[in-house]
């Protein structure tokens, strides 16, 4: 619950908020978990802590790792973890799944697409918006505040939207980009590129050694009856049936659940008697249909002891 996944691109600014909240008067200490080394607060450092925020200005691939924040008040300490992954910039236009923020959906009226994580940054309007890497042009599109407004939304407006803005820190400018998928609600049945609702991309699932654990892969594929749609789990890139571990089995959940009219599928991965070696595996939730395949990766971690009051 108090671990948060954050990601960014090398040479861009990345600002991460401590997953534990506290009043502005509380002090927050940040550490690099692997070395327990304190993160400096001096702004001359490329990576520095500023209260609840951890700033990478700019980020480097080597910054990837788990960072610990401790919120200190006069009566208690609260600990949180930020799992940071910095990726190399892609040379092509395609934005991989692991760089995508949550999907938003719009109706045929006007719709807003908010720029993800922008609240953490010191940015200046206007934002730049791109759809499938093309700069948006035309009177139907308007950048306003931290969102894009699309008037008279059409099914063709579905796609991946990227916002680009400049973060200013003490007079220095850093670029930031963020991408999310936009889907269009339609009264008629339709099919779209799979959208995985759970698990979240790069989710860390806490489990107890010796206990049973369940992972649910849930994805939606459009509206109405789908010609071809499937969800499944893979272990280290191998189908469950081929992996050969009888303790780990998958079974279908709800076959076609029409929540909000969407056609969705669930697949539950059941791990009996969780073992230490299970923590080393990569668990992939795969959703596929005629449009293509989407993959979300989960890793298991040993459940941390509950935070103690100081």
């Amino acid at each position: 619950k108090f671990s948060k996944q954050s990601w960014g691109l090398e040479n861009e600014a990345l600002i991460v908020r401590c997953p534990r909240q506290g009043k502005p008067s509380y002090t927050v200490d940040w550490y690099y978990s692997q070395t327990n080394k304190s993160i400096p607060t001096q702004e001359r450092n490329r990576v520095f802590a500023s209260g609840q925020l951890l700033k990478f200005l700019p980020a480097a691939v080597a910054d990837s790792g788990i960072y610990t924040c401790i919120v200190r008040s006069p009566t208690f300490n609260r600990t949180g973890y930020a799992n940071v992954t910095i990726y190399k910039k892609q040379s092509d236009c395609n934005v991989p799944d692991y760089l995508m923020y949550s999907t938003v959906s719009g109706s045929e009226k006007n719709s807003k697409i908010y720029c993800p994580t922008i609240d953490l940054y010191n940015w200046t309007a206007p934002l730049e918006w791109f759809k499938n890497c093309q700069a948006l042009q035309g009177s139907r599109y308007r950048a306003h505040k931290s969102f894009l407004v699309i008037d008279n939304v059409m099914t063709e407006d579905a796609g991946d939207y990227t916002c680009k803005f400049i973060h200013n820190e003490n007079g220095a400018n850093y670029s930031v980009t963020a991408t999310r998928s936009f889907t269009v609600k339609d009264e008629q049945g339709f099919s779209l590129f799979p959208v995985i609702g759970a698990p979240a991309q790069n989710e860390i699932k806490e489990v107890e050694i010796g206990k049973n654990a369940n992972l649910t892969c849930s994805a939606c594929f459009g509206k109405g009856t789908q010609f071809l749609a499937a969800v499944l789990w893979q272990l280290n890139g191998t189908k469950i049936t081929d992996f050969g571990e009888p303790r780990i089995q998958q079974e279908e959940g709800q076959n076609q659940s029409f929540s909000n009219g969407l056609a969705c599928l669930d697949m539950v991965l059941r791990i009996a008697d969780v073992k230490e070696e299970d923590l080393l595996l990569q668990y992939d939730c795969l959703a596929l249909n005629l449009h293509g395949l989407r993959r979300h990766t989960v890793r298991l971690s040993r459940k941390n002891p509950i935070d103690h009051h100081s």
């Epitope: 109706s107 719709s111 306003h144």
Partner: antibody, heavy 117, light 111 residues
């Protein structure tokens, strides 16, 4: 500051225009909203006009209200008032450069509209 | 349009105590945090307390704290004062169309 005016007693069906006069800031930098409150009831969002002059209305308010502006005023026209439109009407300023659309930092005192035959 | 459901009124609190008001949305607010809290006293316009779900508005005492994300939000008032007696409203902004929606309001009575 912002201040509403134009509230009065009108008969059903008689169009009425309320005016919000602003000072100390520019309407080209801020979105402005209209909110109303019937006697003894909760707040109800009517719509807003953005700094770029685009207008948006609550689903229930479309066709019943029109929002427009000049350089220092924002008008709310109630096209065909009914008794259900009896309320105090507030004009509110959206925070500058705020990322969202839900935060209004300056409100007028309100103007009372009574619709009765 | 979305519906925001608040803690039913009235909520009683003792001076020096803590009061919690919840606000539940029928759909996720924009960016999971486009929600603000307002305080209104009789005969006065509303006053902003919290915006972006958890950011304290300028001049508002730190006794007021906002938390939550997505569809579930909470306003907590600690060390309640007599002056906190008022009606509190949440207001959400949404991705889908331009509707903003107020919650029904929660009256706080201070004893």
């Amino acid at each position: 500051s912002v201040e509403e005016s134009g509230g009065r007693l009108v008969t059903p069906g008689t169009p009425l225009t309320l005016t919000c006069t602003v000072s100390g800031f520019s309407l080209s930098s801020h979105d402005m909203s209209w909110v109303r409150q019937a006697p003894g009831k909760g707040l109800e969002w009517i719509g807003y006009i953005w700094s770029d002059d685009n207008t948006y209305y609550a689903s229930w308010a479309k066709g019943r209200f029109t929002i427009s502006k000049t350089s220092t005023t924002v008008d709310l026209k109630i096209t065909s008032p009914t008794t259900e439109d009896t309320a105090t009407y507030f004009c509110a300023r959206d925070q500058y450069r705020s990322s969202g659309v839900s935060d209004y930092d300056i409100w007028g005192p309100g103007t009372l509209v009574t619709v009765s035959s | 349009a979305a519906v925001l459901t608040q803690t039913p009124s009235p909520v009683s609190a003792a001076v020096g105590g803590t009061v919690t008001i919840s606000c539940q949305s029928s759909q996720s607010v924009g960016n999971n945090n486009d929600l603000a809290w307002y305080q209104q006293k009789p005969g006065q316009p509303p006053k902003i307390l919290i915006y972006k779900a958890s950011t304290l508005a300028s001049g508002v005492p730190s006794r007021f704290e906002g938390s939550g994300s997505g569809t579930q939000f909470t306003l907590t008032i600690s060390d309640v004062q007599c002056d906190d007696a008022a009606t509190y409203y949440c207001l959400g902004g949404y991705d889908d169309d331009a509707d903003n929606t107020f919650g029904g309001g929660t009256e706080v009575v201070v004893k």
